[in-house]
Amino acid sequence: EVEKTACPSGKKAPEIDESLIFYKKWELEACVDAALLATQMDRVNAIPFTYEQLDVLKHKLDELYPQGYPESVIQHLGYLFLKMSPEDIRKWNVTSLETLKALLEVNKGHEMSPQVATLIDRFVKGRGQLDKDTLDTLTAFYPGYLCSLSPEELSSVPPSSIWAVRPQDLDTCDPRQLDVLYPKARLAFQNMNGSEYFVKIQSFLGGAPTEDLKALSQQNVSMDLATFMKLRTDAVLPLTVAEVQKLLGPHVEGLKAEERHRPVRDWILRQRQDDLDTLGLGLQG
């Protein structure tokens, strides 16, 4: 912490500008008014302050707002956001999507930090649910965001928000998460026709039950092996050889390469050898 010293004559900052770049830490502490800093936070981002100087500016804001910063200041934190701790952020009440976007922009290109995770958590809790605009924003910055949520947290996602989800956003989701998301996706896309529906639902199928897979097998969807391998084992096991053949279409030949891997391995063991032989792939049950 910077020692408290009087501001030298002529060095009191009338505004936040580039003349402060070469101030020493103690001079920033003594000569920059915290209230002025709060009203001109938007300028800080354009000035090449060192991380040491940013520490001093943060300290001034902390003293001015011990209960947490107002959103008018938070929105313009810029690089100073990187100095915040999760404890600092827990004091905030962030309600504007624009504020969220501004802070995520600062962290762009980096992995999700504890600060960002706390910020998102505060924001979503404040909104009560993960609406489409929020999800759009979060997945744009962090494609893996959705899969970082617990099944309980995912349950607050309204079906309408599912339209914002891209296939890559689900890459790291586990079956428990897809179990929650799939019914929402099914509801969201229910009014689409067969082929369009399959394109949209495909990424969510890791949460689909047997009856839905059976229904899909009647629609000539030609599911690729990558999607098939992500299906729930318990949902695949009851499928007949004929149903799997219809589900995969021309991709059925890929079963041979995957015969030692779940769910294909377990499914093969459940089938009669005569039925498997009809595929002509040499699969051994």
Epitope: P8, K24, I47, T50, Y51, E52, Y79
Partner: antibody
Framework: EFQLQQSGPELVKPGASVKISCKAS????????MNWVKQTNGKSLEWIGI????????SYNQKFKGKATLTVDQSSSTAYMQLNSLTSEDSAVYYC????????????WGQGTTLTVSS | QIVLTQSPAIMSASPGEKVTMTCSAS?????MYWYQQKPGSSPRLLIY???NLASGVPVRFSGSGSGTSYSLTISRMEAEDAATYYC?????????FGSGTELEIK
């Protein structure tokens, strides 16, 4: 050991542009601001501007606004200065210089890049 | 911007002699910085924050002053001290340098 290695001498025609590099080694590049300084005829030194390698934010001496553009490449720990619309007035030695902790002077300097603008 | 005037412009000293050069600022500054430059070389930081010796600088160098008047002193001149010395301020934006004092060996 700390080192700022600048690119070699440049001979360019009036009206052209040039980009001078300054590669930092031996310290954490993003922890210290980088300055650029002009020296004409081995005499006076003029401060051109400063850049924060961590955030890419910069500030310029009014005299060099529009003439110089400062950038950094964090991946190679290199600072750059581009000078455009060159005239004979721009012929000089240009230095990059690191600012020490808590603004304690330009503690490390590059070896200088000689720019000659001539037709 | 603040103008720094160095005097004398040129001076010479014998080995072992005490040398003092001054730097006068057109307005008050908080700190002064001093650099040494030898022909064909980059400037080298000697003194920071008015009176602190930079790393590796011999203790025969010292700096002092306040307000608008600052000085650099070499307690005992040595041949290797022959160089041009520049003062610099950044209390007021933009940073500025003095025009230099050229120190020769007698």
């Amino acid at each position: 050991e700390f080192q700022l290695q600048q690119s070699g001498p440049e001979l360019v025609k009036p009206g052209a542009s040039v980009k001078i590099s300054c590669k930092a080694s031996g310290y954490s590049f993003t922890d210290y601001n980088m300055n650029w300084v002009k020296q004409t005829n081995g005499k006076s030194l003029e401060w051109i501007g400063i850049i924060n390698p961590n955030y890419g934010t910069s500030s310029y001496n009014q005299k060099f606004k529009g003439k110089a553009t400062l950038t950094v490449d964090q991946s190679s720990s290199t600072a750059y200065m581009q000078l455009n619309s060159l005239t004979s007035e721009d012929s000089a030695v240009y230095y990059c210089a690191r600012v020490g902790r808590d603004n304690s002077g330009f503690d490390y300097w590059g070896q200088g890049t000689t720019l000659t603008v001539s037709s | 911007q603040i103008v720094l005037t160095q005097s004398p412009a040129i001076m010479s000293a014998s080995p072992g002699e005490k040398v003092t050069m001054t730097c006068s600022a057109s307005s008050s500054v908080s700190y002064m910085y001093w650099y040494q430059q030898k022909p064909g070389s980059s400037p080298r930081l000697l003194i920071y924050d008015t009176s602190n010796l930079a790393s590796g600088v011999p203790v025969r160098f010292s700096g002092s002053g306040s307000g608008t008047s600052y000085s650099l002193t070499i307690s005992r001149m040595e041949a290797e001290d022959a160089a041009t010395y520049y003062c610099q301020q950044w209390s007021s934006y933009p940073p500025t340098f003095g025009s230099g004092t050229e120190l020769e060996i007698k």
